[in-house]
């Protein structure tokens, strides 16, 4: 039986994640039986991707290692589109770590997954960044221009977000 | 079950690059961390390099750091590991492995293997 052998691969699957994340909640992508996407519970979905905020306070090195643990990077925001989808389960009296930096202090910001850094989708609040010796960029809200980046020191404790590829199952 | 097929072993002068394939038959390849281990005969299957899904995270053995590069292509399901400065000592049977999320430096940790390819550095 055809749909039989499916769920027992699906559920053999589910089992190598559940070390990690023992709830996974799926959902069937279009109309094909093979297509089931996957995010950990509590994570929440968009489009290819999982998010997850993350309440502990932590420099952006630990943050990314925090993230990593759980198969997952600091988030990489690509469009205007995934950061309204962020921002919606963000407190905007905290400040949360995205996975960008600037390493050597000389405005060549990177994103954690080598995705280029595209100048003209970036959302810096206005001014910023202003100081090379903020290395590592966080998202915020400020009052007059809603949320945007910001430039801060890296080893200074902040929440953060985590992004990762969707499991296909 | 992920199937995983290394290519691109073979003999080479000590100085020589060579660049290691692995490709995976499994169509949810970002699924899995990868790594590249190393077997010479009578010794421990050694880690050499791992690789997170996303690529953004990789580990080197001290042996290899600096001559040897991990990298992936999620749109090919494939893994390399791209080696130069070959010496004599790495001489082995090279693997690729993989496992769910979160890369790992133990074998023990990994689900799935390639059948191995040999190179040999030799003059």
């Known amino acids: 039986n055809f749909m039989y052998s499916k769920t027992v691969k699906r559920l053999s699957k589910l089992r190598e994640y559940q070390q990690y994340h023992p709830s996974l909640t799926c959902v069937m992508e279009g109309k094909d039986i093979e297509d089931w996407s996957c995010c950990p519970t509590p994570w929440t979905s968009f489009q290819s991707s999982c998010y997850f905020i993350s309440t502990g306070m932590q420099s952006w090195t630990k943050s990314q290692k925090n993230c990593s643990v759980m198969g997952a990077d600091l988030v990489v925001i690509n469009t205007r589109e995934e950061q309204d989808f962020i921002i919606q389960n963000l407190k905007r009296n905290s400040s949360y770590f995205l996975g960008l930096s600037d390493p050597g202090g000389r405005r060549h910001w990177q994103w954690v997954d080598q995705t280029p850094y595209n100048e003209n989708v970036t959302f810096w609040h206005s001014g910023e960044p202003n100081n090379l010796d903020e290395r590592c960029a966080i998202i915020n809200f400020r009052s007059s221009e809603e949320w945007g980046w910001n430039d801060i020191h890296c080893h200074v404790p902040q929440k953060s977000i985590c992004k990762m590829k969707k499991i296909y199952i | 079950q992920v199937q995983l097929q290394e290519s691109g072993g073979g003999l080479v002068q000590p100085g020589d690059s060579l660049r290691l394939s692995c490709t995976a038959s499994e169509r949810t390849f970002t699924n899995y961390a990868m790594a590249w281990f190393r077997q010479a005969p009578g010794k421990e299957r050694d880690v050499l390099a791992t690789?997170?899904?996303?690529?953004?995270?990789?580990f080197y053995a001290e042996s290899v750091k600096g001559r040897f590069t991990i990298s992936r292509d999620n749109t090919k399901n494939t893994v390399y590991l791209q080696m130069n400065s070959l010496e004599p000592e790495d001489t082995a049977v090279y693997y690729c492995?993989?496992?769910?999320?979160?890369?790992?430096?133990?074998?023990?940790?990994?689900?799935?293997w390639g059948q191995g390819t040999q190179v040999t550095v030799s003059s």
């Open positions: 492995a993989a496992r769910p999320l979160v890369p790992s430096e133990d074998p023990d940790n990994y689900n799935y």
């Open positions: 690789i997170s899904r996303s690529g953004s995270s990789t």
